[in-house]
């Protein structure tokens, strides 16, 4: 009685259960009454990452430097190439098919999380007591200068974009 279902890593064809090709190999010929499944290794720059019955291997992803991409991990016969972005850039999607320049945090905002090859800069508004006076992809919000510790007084209040201005204390005359 011909099988209607096959074991794991097998497939049903012509009323027979044939072994799938292992990762890194493609199908040449289905198994027959006389032979096991015939598989061949994927070529250079090709891969298959699952047990399969594919007659063609997939091409490794190309990390196009014109799109700001570079190779993070070279592909093998069983894995695809992983691309990432050049320094200062990050991927536009999970598949990392192109890159955009890291965003800078405007004055009044500081860097909460520095960008990586796959994620953009995360900015946060500088809370009271902190400021940022530059547009930067690295600078956090800095605390206002503490005039007191310098034996000075605040002459001009700080904002989220400016530091306080300290000055000498007015001496009280007797």
């Amino acid at each position: 009685e011909p099988p209607t279902a096959c074991r794991e890593k097998q497939y049903l064809i012509n009323s027979q259960c044939c072994s799938l090709c292992q990762p890194g190999q493609k199908l040449v010929s289905d198994c027959t009454e006389f032979t096991e499944t015939e598989c061949l290794p994927c070529g250079e720059s090709e891969f298959l990452d699952t047990w399969n019955r594919e007659t063609h291997c997939h091409q490794h992803k190309y990390c196009d430097p014109n799109l700001g991409l570079r190779v993070q991990q070279k592909g093998t016969s069983e894995t695809d190439t992983i691309c990432t972005c050049e320094e200062g850039w990050h991927c536009t999607s999970e598949a990392c098919e192109s890159c955009v320049l890291h965003r800078s945090c405007s004055p009044g905002f500081g860097v909460k999380q520095i960008a990586t090859g796959v994620s953009d800069t995360i900015c946060e508004p500088c809370p009271v007591g902190f400021f940022s006076n530059v547009s930067s992809a690295f600078e956090k919000c800095h605390p206002w200068t503490s005039c007191e510790t310098k034996d000075l007084v605040v002459q001009q209040a700080g904002t989220n974009k400016t530091d306080v201005v300290c000055g000498p204390q007015d001496r009280l005359r007797a």
């Epitope: 072994s19 040449v28 010929s29 027959t32 009454e33 006389f34 032979t35 096991e36 015939e38 061949l40």
Partner: antibody, heavy 113, light 112 residues
């Protein structure tokens, strides 16, 4: 439908090289394997060698040194070449597909001077 | 090279009677993937061989159910439950587990 047809020289002189072509139709040689069998008059079947779909070859231990099997997928042909023939190589030569029951009609090759 | 030894060499049988042919291998025919590639052919006089049984016990399409195959490892048997006149010819066992593939020497079945 699936067909295999051998074409050979019929008569070959001792010490010469035999060339037989198996022309197939109804399937692609890149996806199916073909092997060769011969049968001397009044004797049994002898497996000679095969051409796998992927292009690799296997040969009988006793014939390996003088046998070459090749294919031209675009022409749907598998070729057998055997050197240094003797009278013992007189036989019907068959090409066979490695699934089902697809045999050529066979071609008789006589080695004689 | 793997040897397949068939017995008997000649088998005279009365029509309607059963017949049995043995095929012994010089090593196990079980493949690494668990398949056993032992097959049986019939070659009628003046014809090409015809596949009867593949992988020990599977009847090829169009083969009458009076033919059956059995065995494992190194010992295999072809049985004909009731011999008919059209069964006359030479029976060959064949293996395709190990390269080079091989045929047995043949068993000639004739009617008594």
């Amino acid at each position: 439908q699936v067909q295999l047809q051998e074409s050979g020289p019929g008569l070959v002189k001792p010490s010469e090289t035999l060339s037989i072509t198996c022309t197939v139709s109804g399937f692609s040689l890149s996806r199916y394997s073909v092997y060769w069998v011969r049968q001397p008059p009044g004797k049994g079947l002898e497996w000679m060698g095969m051409m796998w779909g992927g292009g690799s070859t296997d040969y009988s231990t006793s014939l390996k040194s003088r046998l070459t099997i090749s294919k031209d997928t675009s022409k749907s042909q598998v070729s057998l070449k055997m050197s240094s023939l003797t009278a013992a190589d007189t036989a019907v030569y068959y090409c066979v597909r490695t699934d089902g029951d697809y045999w050529g009609q066979g071609t008789l090759v006589t080695v004689s001077s | 090279e793997l040897q397949l030894t068939q017995s008997p060499l000649s088998l005279p049988v009365t029509l309607g009677q059963p017949a049995s042919i043995s095929c012994r291998s010089s090593q196990s025919l079980a493949s690494s993937q668990g398949n056993t590639y032992l097959h049986w052919y019939l070659q009628r006089p003046g014809q090409s061989p015809r596949l009867l049984i593949y992988k020990v016990s599977n009847r090829f399409s169009g083969v009458p159910d009076r033919f059956s195959g059995s065995g494992s490892g190194t010992d295999f048997t072809l049985k004909i439950s009731r011999v008919e006149a059209e069964d006359v010819g030479v029976y060959y066992c064949s293996q395709s587990t190990h390269v080079p593939w091989t045929f047995g020497g043949g068993t000639k079945l004739e009617i008594k």
